[in-house]
Structures are given as C-alpha cells and as structure tokens.
Amino acid sequence: ATKLTEEKYELKEGQTLDVKCDYTLEKFASSQKAWQIIRDGEMPKTLACTERPSKNSHPVQVGRIILEDYHDHGLLRVRMVNLQVEDSGLYQCVIYQPPKEPHMLFDRIRLVVTKGFSGTPGSNENSTQNVYKIPPTTTKALCPLYTSPRTVTQAPPKSTADVSTPDSEINLTNVTDIIRVPVFN
C-alpha cells in the first residue's frame, strides 16, 4: 500500500485555495476527475467533479469550488473561493476509472482555515469578481456516487497549491448546481 502523505495549507477566511493536482499520464486526460473531502470515520465525499468525459480547459463550478482540467499539461486545477472556517479538513483529487476504484492523486491537502482575513500585498479582492456575476447556466452534477476509502496503486507527482485573495461571495450550499464559467484570455 502507498503511504498517504499530506500537504498542509493554512489560510484565512475569505481567501482562495488554489491547488493543482498533477495526473501526468495522457490516459487520464479525458477521465472524469473529482475533488473530495475526507472526514474522520467516513467515506470520501465528492464535492465537485468534472464532466464525463472531462473537457479541456472548461471550468466547472459547484458552489464555491471551481474545477478546471488542463489536458495539455496533465493538471487539474481546483479552486475553493471565499473560504470559511468550516471548510477546514482533509481533501483529495481523484480520477474516476470505472469499474476500477478511483485513482487518488497525491498528496492529500490538509486545509486549515482560520478567522480574520489578512490581505496579501498587491492583491485585489475584486480581481475575478466579474466572472461570477455573469448569468450562469446550470446543470445537474453527474458525479458518481461510489467512492472508495482505499488508496490506489502508484502515486503520480505531488500536487501544488498557492494562495490568493477572495474571489466571490458564493456559498457552498447546493452542490448539484454546476456553473459554466467563461474563460477570459
């Protein structure tokens, strides 16, 4: 069994977690991918997933979570905007590959969100505000219900994450609503 490792990120309320999960292999490019939370004693819970097949550079938004799959670089970008203290927890990216178990992308992310916003130098709180004001088209999320608590074979290289300031005031309430976010060049 592969040893589970974690990367810890300590952020303030209102900030954005920006994680890049590295899946490396072309065979995974079109596979459906998901962002899950792992709570003690529970099965991993899928919070958001890409489409099936996963579309290239096509943002999918579920509440305050935005997934964007970059096939050409083997990266799944996960953003959780306007973080709340209750978002603290252990997260992971997985690749669905039915009928096999989901393929977990290492490392897991240990997110710790604390009270009190602390702005970063040169940051703009409204930098992407307009993106989320565009009238959304919504559809039902088609995330597989099955999740496995077990880990899967080999681990691709680590994910990386960085920090930015708040992007919006979207609340993570109805996780079945997906918003297509236009891409601006």
């Epitope: 890049k20 292999l25 072309e26 490019a29 050409d72 670089h73 970008r77 691709p156 990386t160």
Partner: antibody
Framework: EVQLVESGGGLVQPGGSLKLSCAAS????????MHWVRQASGKGLEWVGR??????????YYAASVKGRFTISRDDSKNTAYLQMNSLKTEDTAVYYC????????????WGQGTLVTVSS | DIVLTQSPDSLAVSLGERATINCRAS??????????LHWYQQKPGQPPKLLIY???NLESGVPDRFSGSGSGTDFTLTISSLQAEDVAVYYC?????????FGQGTKLEIK
Amino acid sequence: EVQLVESGGGLVQPGGSLKLSCAASGFTFSTYAMHWVRQASGKGLEWVGRIRTKSSSYATYYAASVKGRFTISRDDSKNTAYLQMNSLKTEDTAVYYCTRDMGIRRQFAYWGQGTLVTVSS
Amino acid sequence: DIVLTQSPDSLAVSLGERATINCRASESVDTFDYSFLHWYQQKPGQPPKLLIYRASNLESGVPDRFSGSGSGTDFTLTISSLQAEDVAVYYCQQSNEDPYTFGQGTKLEIK
C-alpha cells in the same frame, strides 16, 4: 529497468531516406509519449519531435527544421517508435536519440545511446 | 517558438567552488505555478542525463549539490561545490509549449 535502443542509422545521400527505430523495454510503452532529439557533432541538442499516445490519437509534433520531411510513428504492440526521415539534407547529420518523458509535457528521464545518421554524397 | 538562451556559454570554476548557469526564456514557460523547465548534464560520448525537472526538483540519484531555481522566464542551475565529475555541458529545456526547445548549452570546466 527502462531501456531505449535506437537502430537504423547509417550513411545516406542527400535527398535520400532513412528509417530509425527505437525499441523500448522495462515500462508500459503505450502509456508514454516518445520523442526524438538530435545532436550534430560538437553542437547542442535539438528536439526533433514527439508522438503522443493512443489516448491522444497518436498526435505528432515537429521542430520547424524537419516538418514535412520527417514522420514519427509508433507500434505499441512492438514497443517501438520510429522516425522516418525523407529528403535528407547534409545538415541532418547528427546522432539521433530516442527519449521517453515522464508524462504530459514532463521531463526526459530516459534516453537511448543514440544512432548516428550521416548525410553525405 | 520559445528561445532559451543560456549564459555563460562556457564557465571555468575551481574545485569546491560554486558554479552558476543561467537560462532565460523568450517567453514564460510556466503554466500556473509549474515551470516546465528542466536541466540536463551531458558528458562526451554519452546521452544527456536529467538533473533537475520543473525548475527546482532534483531527479532521483542526482547529488544534492545540484539545485535549480527560477520561474517564468529566468532560471538558474547551481552546483554548490564543484566536483571533478561535474565537468560537462549543461542544457536547459522547456516543455511548456510545442515545439520543445533546448538552450544552446554551457560548457563547464575546472579552473
């Protein structure tokens, strides 16, 4: 252990053709893109091109200097990549290396020993 | 095409001293916070050997006197304490965009 072995090099006249092979072992060949890199004597490295996997419809990409003259192909059942070189020029004289990356747009972790192609009349 | 320019073209450093090689890209080789810039070492008669991948990650089995840094367009390969076996030509290479490209190489010698 990953091994890449190039073959097919030799002396060819300008305007002629040559087909290089790269026999791979020690890994799941069909999973990775394969690349060709060349090096003229005493000169630097030049990326020639790459072929992606079946998942990416075996898409190929080439350096401008060889586009339209060179063709990269692969046979996953034989664990072999190929470089078909047509309309050869004297400036194509070089050692040709076969390389394997570590995944999508990743680094070249594995290299063959190279095969020498000499284009001369 | 992304042009990679290495400096200097050649470098002579005393044993035990620090060697620094720079690589400048004509445009960014970053995608998000990943720099798709790698460093290779090549000795005469041998194929290149990977030293550093994605700007700063040390390849398995490579001595830790080698390190890489940088992002965007400016990158550096550093050998903290030059050893005799480090005499070679060093190349940077980008894979962020097709066509992939190499720097022209830097020849490292002992002073």
